[in-house]
């Protein structure tokens, strides 16, 4: 049975880096609710001091890549491409380290947005991190 | 209170080029997608083109595309539809709105276009 | 693109009637229709969002419904303000399209 669903993105927060491509959806209308909340956090995001330009550079497309994964075409059956772990973690460690720690003490912004947990993606290695998507 | 102010309408001949600003003011300018929305005289309304200004993320409507482009400045707080090889049937009132969970709930008071030789 | 096909196109009523009027999405658009109200010389506005969802400041008289891919607009009482052009549209895929619009007029 499958779990999801793959569907071209109809959003527009985050067209600039995935254009129509297809994303994975857990189901078939959830599109629209994560355009929203998305599109809340960027609002907070932006109005947020504590975004430096190096991290946000990098930070945005990730989220977005993030909340509306490509779908595995090499896959038969629905599936999403992960993040790679290797940028997850220069994107958390290096690059946007202060705003990560920011993020996850403030409650405001994990209710609006979903932080990637880089230990959850495959090893840069496996067979699984093949086609993970780099930013 | 939030306002969307058009202006940059007029007569301009087929072929040529206007350029219409939408001035906001009352919210993040830069947390809310613009719209361009037109309506020709006595007819529907016809979705035109949406900026994210915040990701600079753009959209436009097959009739549109390829002519005209949509930006916005967010340090002015201002969007913007370029348009070129204008034809006869762009002419129409073009209305700049703010979208509100993928709605439309605040418009500008729109400007006239006429494309005319 | 999706398709609003809206009906009727005109309909003449009186004030205090019961009015409603029909949206039909080509596609499955889920529940992402919003409704507007067009008076002439001015800027459509919001009244119903989500298919459903009363806008802020909207009088209680309107509401909206979905059935599948049917979405309605009804207005129970209609009070002589509601005499106006009302459109649907969809906003699940771009390009976001709207129906023909619905004249109300006064019978």
């Known amino acids: 049975e499958e779990d999801g669903f793959c569907q071209p993105y109809r959003g527009i927060a985050c067209a600039r880096f995935i254009g129509n491509r297809t994303v994975y959806m857990e189901s078939l209308h959830m599109q629209g609710e994560i355009e929203n909340q998305i599109t809340a956090a960027f609002t907070m995001i932006g109005t947020s001091s504590h975004l430096s330009d190096k991290c946000s550079q990098f930070a945005i497309p990730s989220l977005c890549h993030y909340a509306f994964p490509y779908c595995d075409e090499t896959s038969s059956v629905p599936k999403p491409r992960d993040l790679c772990r290797d940028e997850c973690e220069i994107l958390e460690n290096v690059l946007c380290q202060t705003e990560y720690i920011f993020a996850r003490s403030n409650p405001m912004i994990l209710m609006r947005l979903k932080l990637p947990n880089c230990e959850d993606l495959p090893q840069p290695e496996s067979p699984e991190a093949a086609n993970c998507i780099r930013i | 209170e939030v306002q969307l102010v058009e202006s940059g309408g007029g007569l301009v001949q087929p072929g040529g080029s206007l350029r219409l600003s939408c001035a906001a003011s009352?919210?993040?300018?830069?947390?809310?997608?613009i719209h361009w929305v037109r309506q020709a005289p006595g007819k529907g309304l016809e979705w035109v083109a949406a900026i994210y200004p915040y990701t600079d993320s753009t959209r436009y409507a097959d009739s549109v595309k390829g002519r005209f482009t949509i930006s916005a400045d967010t340090s002015k707080n201002t969007a913007y539809l370029q348009m070129n090889s204008l034809r006869a049937e762009d002419t129409a009132v073009y209305y700049c709105?703010?979208?509100?969970?993928?709605?439309?709930?605040?418009w500008g008071q729109g400007t006239l276009v006429t494309v005319s030789s | 693109d999706i398709q609003m096909t809206q009906s009727p196109s005109s309909l003449s009523a009186s004030v205090g009637d019961r009015v409603t009027i029909t949206c039909r999405a080509s596609q499955s658009v889920s529940s992402a229709v919003a409704w507007y109200q067009q008076k002439p010389g001015k800027a459509p506005k919001l009244l119903i969002y989500?298919?459903?969802s009363l806008y802020s400041g909207v009088p209680s008289r309107f509401s909206g419904s979905r059935s599948g891919t049917d979405f309605t607009l009804t207005i129970s009482s209609l009070q002589p303000e509601d005499f106006a052009t009302y459109y649907c549209q969809q906003y699940t895929d771009f390009p976001w399209t709207f129906g023909q619009g619905t004249k109300v007029e006064i019978k």
């Open positions: 009352g919210f993040t300018f830069y947390g809310y997608t």
């Open positions: 989500s298919a459903s």
């Open positions: 709105a703010r979208d509100y969970r993928r709605a439309l709930d605040y």
